[in-house]
């Protein structure tokens, strides 16, 4: 009995015309929701006068669906036995799941000064910024829609800077009609302890962004995993949003509308420095802001992102030190609601469940040339919002799952 | 390559002007940011004027507002800074500048000397 349902199971999850993993893996039957809550800035005068500490205050939910777009460029190689595709990306506003509309204003860091003056450290460069943050009335913090901060807005600043830059500023700009990938996947059709694991992204097996195995693309995009997922194992995915590649370890077993599922989170040690985790040594990229990286709970990825000094953490600095959430008044980190999970079927090794949690946080550094950013005393990285992204298996799904695989085997 | 040679330097009296100019050679002037700077003996370095290829603003240091005017000829492929009614404070040397957001320091001239005194 057993091997027969290990044979059907090794059968269905290859990605290959005519299987149930290829059906919901070209397009996923979940309803993909990314919730976002924005850090409104309380007090922009005292902080760009005083350097006082930043007081935020989050609002949201404002709720988006998204992954709701099949896969494109789907393409077997049958001689490596790979898949390749593109992942459009497409965001819809959802206003009943949402506590305002995409026009609601927020205060928030200035994105391009921030970025343009860490951009460019040279002194008179500096001098000319400054110059063109005051001719276009800009400041160290700005008012935004959410619809542009989140997509995209003209810079006023940015407009005056010279040829040639992108004018248009946004925390997800570009983002509908664009694809995230080429991802290229093995099929599974040859070793099925391979399916899902990415083995080249963009062309490349390495990012370019990092030094040593820090740099490396492991395992497969979280969505699904080999089968025959075991509690012992360390679940290795590639994340393009934070640049990197992470592990889970199983945390307990979660019964999901009737089907056993293992629960596997990211565990506190995948952000510590490399001072309590020396694998992380790679991912310490500068030692200033880092305080010679003892600084943990942040990845800088502005090698990811031509430049700009935009950093990565959990939401509200969980498992982050105190020197980076100090500067920063009005968060309250919790595990319940701020990590991230996967609740993986184990015998198909689908994620079945997921909460995907992470914050975007910019530096923004004292600037001595630079009016607006002159009286600042110390280097914040200031959080300008996160992100809640889930999916659940639907009930019918569930059913079907439940009758095909797990009521088969129980 | 990229060259800016300034010219129109000199002595000036008091209340006197002076027209500096700035050829520019190996790039198109239109796309840049274009500066002038100058630095007096024992001083930093300061921006005095800027003329951005965005629309042709123009933005000026507060000591020369209302004295100083910057222009760009791009078919001449020139730059020019105005100076009336001059003061001994504005004795120093002038550098033209060029830079857009391609670079991560601007481009220089050699500079030209402005001396103001009676």
């Known amino acids: 009995g057993d091997l027969l349902i290990q044979k059907t199971i090794k059968k269905q999850v290859v990605l290959e015309e005519g299987t149930i993993a290829f059906k919901n893996w070209v397009k996923t039957g979940t309803e993909v929701y990314r919730q976002f809550w924005i850090f409104d800035v309380q007090n922009p005068q005292e902080v760009m006068m005083n350097s006082s500490n930043i007081q935020v205050k989050q609002r949201g939910p404002y709720t988006y669906r998204v992954r709701f777009l099949a896969k494109e460029n789907v393409t077997q190689d049958a001689e490596d036995n790979t898949v390749s595709f593109l992942q459009p990306n497409g965001a819809i506003f959802e206003p009943s799941l949402s506590v305002g509309t995409e026009a609601d204003n927020f205060t928030v860091l200035n994105l391009a000064v921030a970025a343009a003056s860490h951009i460019y450290q040279n002194q008179f460069v500096q001098m000319i910024l400054n110059s063109l943050i005051n001719k276009s009335k800009s400041s160290m913090f700005q008012v935004r829609t959410l619809r542009e901060l989140l997509w995209g807005y003209r810079d006023p600043f940015l407009s005056l800077v010279p040829y040639p830059v992108t004018t248009t500023v946004g925390l997800f700009y570009p983002y509908n009609n664009t694809a995230d990938g080429v991802y290229k996947v093995f099929n599974g059709k040859d070793n099925i302890s391979k399916v899902a694991i990415i083995d080249t992204y963009k062309g490349k097996r390495n990012l370019s962004y990092w030094e040593s195995h820090c740099d490396m693309i492991n395992g497969t995009d979280a969505a699904s995993f080999p089968p025959f997922v075991e509690k012992s194992q360390v679940l290795q995915f590639f994340s393009s949003d934070i640049c990197r590649s992470i592990y889970a370890v199983f945390e307990s077993d979660v019964n999901l509308k009737g089907i056993p599922v293992y629960r596997f989170v990211l565990p506190s040690k995948a952000f510590a420095s490399p001072v309590e985790n020396p694998d992380n040594y790679c991912f310490c990229t500068e030692k200033i802001i880092s305080k010679n990286c003892t600084s943990y709970g942040v990845l800088d990825i502005s090698k990811c992102k031509e430049g700009r000094p935009v950093y990565i953490s959990l939401p509200h600095f969980l498992y982050a030190s105190p020197d980076v959430s100090e500067p920063i008044d009005g968060l309250n980190p919790n595990e319940e609601e701020h990590r991230t999970y996967l609740d993986i079927e184990p015998i198909t090794g689908f994620t079945l469940q997921f909460a995907k949690r992470l914050q975007v946080n910019l530096l923004v550094k004292p600037s001595e040339k630079i009016q607006v950013l002159k009286n600042l005393k110390r280097n914040y990285i200031v959080p300008i919002l996160w992100l809640n992204e889930t999916g659940t298996i639907g009930d019918e799904k569930a059913n079907m799952f439940r009758s095909q695989v797990t009521g088969k085997i129980n | 390559q990229v060259q800016l040679q300034e010219s129109g330097g000199g002595l000036a009296q008091p209340g006197g002007s002076l027209r500096l100019s700035c050829a520019a050679s190996?790039?198109?002037?239109?796309?840049?940011?274009m500066s002038w700077y100058r630095q007096a003996p024992g001083k930093e370095r300061e921006l005095v004027a800027l003329i951005t290829s965005a629309g042709g603003i123009t933005d000026y240091a507060d000591s020369v507002k209302g004295r100083f005017t910057i222009a760009r000829d791009d078919a001449e492929k020139t730059v020019s800074l105005q100076m009336n009614s001059l003061k001994p404070e504005d004795t120093a040397v002038y550098y033209c500048?060029?830079?857009?957001?391609?670079?991560?320091?601007?481009?220089w001239g050699q500079g030209t000397q402005v001396t103001v005194s009676s």
């Open positions: 190996g790039f198109t002037v239109s796309t840049y940011a």
């Open positions: 500048s060029a830079w857009r957001a391609t670079l991560f320091k601007p481009y």
